[in-house]
């Protein structure tokens, strides 16, 4: 037997974070993100649940809504009518998936301070907004859109074909809340209130995907979820424009779908209004390496919606998808017609430009071997976005403004030497027009969120910036964390790693990687976290490191690219590398290295462990994918195209964690799911282990009852992470 | 190639009705980008669309002079579109033109021979 080995923080009295930190949430931090509700006036929640309005020029501020109104009706969010008149208040919340999620709403009369009463809102509710302007509602019940001019009128029912489980309009199914749209609403107002886009999702023909949950009752329930798994039917889906002014005179117009795209299996991929009668939509053929933006207008004289060819612009990409995760969205000048949009150069890195009459003539705005990420606000004169490029870190985020009105354009970084230690990974929200916007950094020191003047840039006030956090991590050990990169051949790789304190390169520790590596992703950030790994490292004396292979984002095309349609492949062989070289560094026992990962990860930590290297001693796997057949439609197919003979069958079945059940002899294996998966079904952890089993390999497993893939109900999350904490201690021998 | 027949107009006292029909052909009245609208022309008159609608939705709108009497539809599987004329008055009379406008193309409008409708007693 080995001798145990316990790690000791030595020398001063700052105490190591323990697990129970971690599980209670000890040391997380806050955002401020204002609700803007004009140029210069904004709504936030304060701590003690009032709804208090702010005013930046004047500098008043008052509470809205008390937090008495709001415990009245058990309120968790509110939502503030354009004209101020009222506002709807949300409880009950009930989580579904991602992003959906119903519940009761409530709307309060500001001005006579009483509830509305008289036809009020059915529940529960899935969906529900005001209009830009006034106070109209459109709501979406039982898969149907409902419209009310005024809160307190009897609503007026927009669709009929609405069914569980069939239909759904206004809101997404499945799929397209995860894999395409990532909301929970599939309707959108035009910006005067006069139209209401929505989309239709005929789910009749889809495979059903069916889980037990178990409950406490004598019998499980079963949960039916139409659910396209790659190669199998997709939702038919339709856009359709209503005119709420008139809403029964006219019904609903449906938008026609580019030729081009409407001639095979296509998905609708987002919605624009780009003024109060021409609408932006997306279109991307099933195979998702051809986009469509269409503009269209509303013909006053035939009370039509005409997308003429000429305003069809086409998005390709030759080495693999369009767009990075999705498709980017057009942000519209003022003039209504040209735009900017973020898509490939010629080197393949993702850049502005801009696009007045087709993408041929598009002017690149942006260049150079980093990527524009995501374009905020265009306004007359400026356009704010965020990049990777300062300092060359992909890891990185910052606010650039350009100066549109200029001739040429200038470039200024507006947040590059703010707090240049504590912050290099930001956001901001804007107001309408960018007078004002609202700065948060995340990190990779304490975040903090602050106000800013949208002409100066100027820092008007501090917003957050957790200081009682600061506080609470003085008497902390935390571990040093380093970001750099490593070469192999001609590739480049970044990597994160996380020392343990009072580090010394003349140790040996042992080693985990922590494993996402899904396309498009990014794992090595300039981020603050105290999480399970901070706590690893802190101690329990574990060295991790976090790696960025080929296939993550923001490094180029060719780097992103290279998995196209062989997922499972250079994901593993690129951590493989990574640890290789981390063992070169000298501190690494060889003896006691792991892996682990969960949903895509958990395929990259699985496939890893079973490379048959000798290199991971024991690994965990939560809620891994294990073969692509058994995942989404959209997002399967985007990077592997389809499982057919004729395409890509050959490589989904090579690519499965099942082919390899031999090769998990040597290695130590924690698999665990959650048994109500809608995400990543149970299914996929099944199959491991019944190849397992098969093979007559042994492993350990843990499932978690009616949980979903996030694991997140308290006692489950607890139990995971104890769980998981005691099988690494025993495989790099640390006593407890 | 593209053509709408009309048919069913006809002379009609006051109050009567008629229904007129619009045959397509060369192209699907069923798709998302078409709609199919009736154009009236009247000597001294200036051009009417009294009604429109779009197949595929179901979406229907018609001028104020006709509402609560027109009613435009169509049968998918004929690929036909139809305006049923109830009440009606001396001021219908015109040549009644089937129009089909495709959303891809702007004022892009195929037009038929036209029917016409006299209301006399």
């Known amino acids: 037997l080995r001798p145990s080995r316990v790690y000791k923080p030595e020398g001063n009295t700052k105490r190591a974070l323990t697990l129970k930190d971690i599980l209670n949430g000890t040391f997380s931090y806050k955002t401020y993100f204002p609700n803007w509700i004009s140029e210069q006036e904004y709504l936030h929640q304060s701590e003690d649940d009032n709804i208090v309005f702010y005013n930046i020029e004047t500098r008043e501020s008052y509470i809205i809504l008390s937090n008495s109104t709001m415990k009245s009706v058990n309120a968790t969010d509110y939502g503030l009518s354009p004209d101020r008149q009222f506002v709807y208040l949300e409880s009950d919340y009930s989580k579904l998936w991602r992003y959906s999620y119903t519940a009761t709403y409530y709307i309060y009369d500001l001005q006579n301070g009483e509830f509305v009463r008289g036809y009020e809102l059915p529940r529960p509710i899935q969906y529900l907004c005001w209009s830009p302007v006034g106070s109209k509602l459109a709501y979406v019940y039982q898969n149907n859109i409902y419209l009310k001019q005024r809160p307190g009128d009897p609503p007026f029912q927009i669709t009929y074909t609405g069914r569980e489980n069939r239909i759904f309009n206004g809101i997404p199914d499945w799929v397209y809340e995860e894999e395409m749209l990532a909301t929970k609403y599939a309707l959108w107002w035009s910006p005067d209130g006069k139209f209401l886009a929505y989309v239709e999702f005929n789910d009749s023909d889809i495979p059903i995907i069916a889980y037990s949950y178990y409950g406490d009752g004598q019998y499980p329930r079963t949960i039916n979820i139409p659910y396209p798994k790659a190669g199998a039917k997709n939702p038919v889906v339709r856009v359709f424009i209503v005119d709420t002014t008139y809403p029964h005179h006219v019904g609903p117009m449906e938008v026609p779908v580019p030729e081009m795209i409407a001639s095979s299996d296509y998905y609708f991929s987002w919605l624009t209004w780009v003024s109060s009668e021409r609408v932006c939509l997306q279109w991307l053929k099933r195979v998702q390496n051809v986009s469509v933006l269409s503009i269209c207008d509303f013909r006053e004289d035939w009370h039509a919606w005409e997308c003429p060819k000429n305003q069809e612009h086409v998005e390709e990409s030759r080495t693999g998808w369009a767009g990075g995760f999705f498709v980017s969205t057009p942000a519209f000048s003022q003039d209504a017609t040209s735009y900017y949009k973020i898509f490939s150069d010629k080197d393949g890195y993702k850049h502005i430009h801009y696009i007045k009459d087709t993408v041929e003539n598009a002017i690149q705005i942006t260049s150079g071997k980093w990527e524009a990420i995501y374009i905020f606000r265009v306004t007359q004169d400026s356009l704010f976005y965020s990049s990777n490029e300062f300092e060359g870190y992909p890891g990185r985020r910052n606010i650039y403004r350009i100066s549109i009105g200029n001739s040429p354009p200038s470039k200024k970084c507006v947040t590059c030497h703010l707090r240049k230690e504590r912050c290099q990974y930001y956001t901001a929200s804007f107001s309408y027009k960018a007078k004002y916007y609202a700065l948060v950094c995340y990190g990779p020191g304490l975040p903090i969120s602050t106000l800013h003047d949208g002409r100066t840039d100027q820092e008007i006030q501090v917003l957050e910036e957790n200081k009682e956090l600061e506080n609470s991590l003085r008497n902390i050990q935390l571990p040093k964390v380093e970001i750099k990169k490593l070469k192999d051949g001609g590739l480049t790789f970044w990597y994160k790693m996380i020392l343990p304190p009072q580090f010394d390169r003349s140790k040996k520790y042992p080693l985990l990687i922590q494993v996402y590596g899904g396309p498009c992703s990014q794992s090595v950030k300039s981020v603050f976290a105290v999480n399970w790994i901070t706590y690893l490292a802190s101690k329990e004396g574990i060295v991790i490191a976090l790696v960025d292979g080929r296939g993550t984002a923001f490094q180029g095309d060719k780097f992103l690219h290279a998995v196209y349609r062989k997922l499972g492949v250079y994901e593993v062989e690129d951590q493989l590398t990574a640890v290789r070289k981390f063992i070169e560094m000298g501190f690494i026992d060889e003896e006691r290295i792991a892996i682990w990962g969960w949903s895509y990860g958990g395929y990259v930590s699985s496939l890893a462990l079973a490379s048959g290297t000798g290199l991971f001693k024991c690994g965990i796997a939560v809620a891994p994918v294990s073969s692509w057949e058994y995942y989404a439609s959209i997002y399967s197919e985007r990077f592997m195209g389809l499982p057919t003979k004729d395409d890509n069958l050959e490589h989904y079945k090579n690519s499965t964690v099942m082919a390899r059940a031999e090769y998990f002899r040597n290695v130590d294996y924690l698999l665990i799911h959650g048994t109500a998966d809608d995400n990543v079904h149970f299914q996929n952890s099944a199959q491991i282990a019944k190849a397992l089993v098969n093979a007559q390999v042994d492993f350990q497993a843990m499932w978690y009852s009616d949980q979903n893939h996030g694991i997140s109900s308290g006692r489950s999350q607890n139990h995971l992470y104890t769980h998981m904490t005691h099988f690494l201690k025993q495989c790099f021998s640390l006593s407890d | 190639e593209v053509q709408l027949v009309e048919s069913g107009g006809g002379l009609v006292q006051p109050g009567g009705s008629l229904r007129l029909s619009c045959a397509a052909s060369?192209?699907?009245?069923?798709?998302?980008?078409?709609?199919i609208g009736w154009v009236r022309r009247a000597p001294g008159k200036e051009e009417e669309l009294v009604a429109r609608?779009?197949?595929?939705?179901?979406?229907?709108r018609y001028a104020d002079s006709v509402k609560g009497r027109f009613t435009i539809s169509c049968d998918t599987s004929k690929n036909t579109a139809y305006l049923q004329m109830n009440s009606l008055r001396a001021e219908d009379t015109a040549v009644y033109y089937c129009a089909g406008r495709s959303a891809r193309s702007y004022s892009y409008i195929y037009w038929g021979q036209g029917t016409t409708v006299t209301v006399s007693s």
């Open positions: 060369g192209f699907n009245i069923k798709d998302s980008s078409t709609y």
């Open positions: 609608i779009q197949c595929s939705a179901g979406s229907t």
